[in-house]
């Protein structure tokens, strides 16, 4: 058992700039942290549970975003975060760390809290070393952080597995550790076996090299996935052509927590009881308790402790702890081939030319998606639309005035005149029509239709405006 | 801190081909739409092309479609334009630049690339 | 396609000179417009995003106005080491399109 430990020291702007937060804080805020631990080094990790555990920090002192920039140092919750562990240290673990910012305006439904920055790295740390340094980039902000493991007595070593009980209350000076079991004083620390892999191998007793998890090898110097088949180096199967180990991985039973124990090629496998696993059976359970949904999602816990829980994510993010984010543009919001732009706190469509909408779903060269001015109607065809303006105007959408008169619709010396409702023609003497295209008889009557009752030849005669269309 | 830096200019022949690099540091790569935009000797700015952060989706100028064509390796952060059927009027500095919509997200450093000069002479 | 109208091409101005400069939309673009300034051999430099949101980094006598179809980048006292063209680009759609530029020279 033991102790993960974290220290933040600064959270700020990185070097070039301030950066913008996606949501504008309106009132006073504080800044908090959460840690999650993850065992092992492999990529699937990320979509894991944090199986070694998480902590929340306390909430840091209340600061007021300035309009333009952050403080440079945004103030800091007090203390450490602590990730207590039980049973074995696994050495190599995915180390996450989030800044959250808890705006403490007058929203509904109390404050809202906003991912600034997250950090994911994955480290190999053995047990009671120094405190390792590290300095990370979050976009535009830097985290600077350290952070140790130390075993709690009685266990000690790297891993945190050898239990030592002193028998007497003697305290151990500095470069030493308590006593080996039933001994009554203290030691230095072994020194391992010449060669010993110094990333991979650690000892409890001097002379040794034990692996951390996924290496082995007399100097932990081989990956366990490659350890099964040394080709023609020590005794071989005949049924593999691979080493036959000497004690098998399964003696002395690896898996903790009465986990059962079988052979796999070159290692080992654990079947664990009920509320526990990881590699040896190692991991208690984790419960909504520990808090191990990310980004506001919800914990649902099952019936009994043994069950597993599960985070109900927010939109925009996915993962059994609600930690990776949505590829939302992967679910193609843009129709008609927009871009699909994630801004963060929003998603935005760039539309190709001839289309438009929040979604690019209006087709702007289709009679749906467009309205003609001024009376006008829309005419659609071959993939395109097109206006029929109404007498006086034109253009694209029949937004321009147009002079009916330019085309000089007026026959036989006729004068145009614009109207409200149409084109005008005033005829010439002997003519008539709307376009003065009819001359009149000697004797008064027209050779064809007569002038409506009331129309005596040579007034002015209107031109209905549904004759008359300019087509774009 | 973003930085862009482009690559594979030079001198080519009329009807040649080419291909610009442009190597991306200080942000997620691939999660950024980016763009190729050149200029001419003297001459204003001309946009290229734009490709989606997960290289889905590409855009090209009227001047340049069917001609180029813009890609990115985003387990190398790196931004590509293959310039085929090269002509003289391509002639330009072509800068790399992250997308605009992300400028107020983004404020760290340069959202353009120091530019890569293509001369298209025989 | 949307054609972003710039005026002046170009001007002469003092130091201590209030210059604005304007850019037209053949259509709305909302406010998805840059101006940038560029330096003869230099990259351009952003300075307004989104009509009127100053960069981080860029000084306060620059500011940007408009929405819709007219747009203005206003300098409100000239300095030595602002003369320079400057740009407009539009990024509301597809194809995006620059102004041709206003060159700010010395009077």
């Known amino acids: 058992a033991g102790v993960f430990e974290l220290q933040i020291h600064s959270f700020g702007p990185g070097p070039g700039g301030a950066p913008r937060s996606p949501y504008s804080a309106r009132g006073p805020c504080r800044l908090f942290f959460r840690v999650c631990l993850k065992p092992g080094l492999s990529e699937e990790a990320a979509e894991s549970p944090c199986a070694l555990g998480a902590a929340l920090s306390a909430r840091g002192p209340v600061y007021t975003e300035q309009p333009e920039a952050p403080a440079p140092d945004l103030p800091l919750p007090n203390g450490l975060l602590q990730v207590p562990f039980r049973d074995a240290w696994p050495g190599t673990f995915s180390l996450i760390i989030e800044t959250w910012r808890e705006e403490l305006g007058d929203q509904i439904g109390g404050p809202a809290w906003s991912l600034l920055a997250r950090v994911t790295r994955r480290r190999r740390l053995a047990a009671g070393g120094p405190w390792a340094g590290d300095i990370q980039r979050a976009g535009a902000w830097e985290l600077r952080f350290s952070y140790r493991a130390r075993c709690e007595l009685p266990a000690v070593g790297t891993a945190c597995t050898r239990l030592c009980r002193p028998r007497s209350a003697s305290r151990c000076g500095p470069g030493l550790r308590p006593c080996a079991p039933l001994e009554d004083e203290c030691e230095a620390p072994p020194v391992c076996r010449a060669g010993c892999s110094l990333e991979h191998g650690f000892c409890e007793q001097p002379g040794e090299c034990r692996c951390l998890e996924g290496w082995t090898g007399p100097l932990c110097m081989v990956p366990v996935s490659t350890s099964s088949c040394l080709g023609l180096r020590g005794p071989s199967s005949t049924t593999t052509g691979c080493l036959v180990p000497g004690p098998g991985p399964c003696d002395g039973n690896p898996c903790a927590n009465g986990g059962s124990c079988s052979e796999t090629p070159g290692s080992f496998e654990c079947t664990c009881p009920r509320g526990f696993y990881g590699l040896r059976c190692e991991v208690s359970g984790v419960t909504c308790a520990d808090g191990p949904c990310f980004n506001g999602g919800l914990c649902v816990g099952g019936a009994d402790p043994d069950s597993a829980y599960i985070c109900h994510c927010p939109p925009g993010f996915q993962g059994s702890n609600c930690e990776k984010r949505v590829d939302r543009c992967s679910l193609q919001p843009c129709r008609n081939g927009g871009l699909c732009l994630d801004l963060g706190h929003a998603l935005r469509c760039r539309c190709r030319a001839g289309f438009a909408g929040p979604r690019c779903e209006h087709d702007l060269n289709d009679c749906a998606g467009r309205a003609c001015a001024n009376g006008g109607t829309c005419v659609e065809g071959g993939g395109a639309h097109r206006c029929s303006c109404a007498l006086g105007f034109g253009g694209r959408d029949c937004r321009e005035r147009a002079d009916p008169c330019a085309a000089r619709p007026c026959a036989h010396g006729g004068r145009c005149y614009a109207h409200f409702s149409g084109l005008v023609c005033a005829c010439a003497p002997g003519y008539m029509g709307a376009r003065c295209e009819f001359p009149v008889h000697p004797d008064g009557v027209s050779a064809l239709p007569a002038a409506p009752p009331g129309l005596r030849p040579g007034d002015p005669q209107r031109y209905p405006h549904h004759h008359h269309h300019h087509h774009h | 801190e973003v930085q862009l830096l482009e690559s594979g200019g030079g001198l080519v022949q009329p009807g040649g081909s080419l291909r610009l690099s442009c190597a991306a540091s200080?942000?997620?790569?691939?999660?950024?739409?980016m763009n190729w935009v050149r200029q001419a000797p003297g001459k204003g700015l001309e946009w290229v092309s734009t490709i989606s952060g997960s290289g889905g989706s590409t855009y090209y100028a009227d001047s340049v479609k069917g001609r180029f064509t813009i890609s990115r390796d985003n387990s190398k952060n790196t931004l590509y334009l293959q310039m085929n059927s090269l002509r003289a009027e391509d002639t330009a500095v072509f800068y790399c630049?992250?997308?605009?919509?992300?400028?107020?997200?983004?404020?760290?450093?340069?959202?353009w690339g120091q530019g890569t000069l293509v001369t298209v002479s025989s | 396609d949307i054609q972003m109208t710039q005026s002046p091409s170009a001007m002469s101005a003092s130091v201590g000179d209030r210059v604005t400069i304007t850019c037209r939309a053949s259509q709305g673009i909302s406010n998805y417009l840059a101006w940038f300034q560029q330096k003869p051999g230099k990259v351009p430099k952003r300075l307004i995003y989104a009509a009127s949101s100053l960069q981080s980094g860029v000084p306060s006598r620059f500011s940007g106005s408009g929405s819709g179809t007219e747009f203005t980048l206003t300098i409100s006292s000239l300095q030595p080491e602002d003369f320079a063209t400057y740009f407009c680009l539009q990024h509301d759609s597809f194809p995006l399109t620059f102004g041709g530029g206003t060159k700010v020279e010395i009077k």
């Open positions: 630049a992250i997308d605009p919509e992300y400028y107020d997200i983004l404020t760290g450093g340069d959202y």
């Open positions: 200080g942000f997620t790569f691939s999660s950024y739409a």
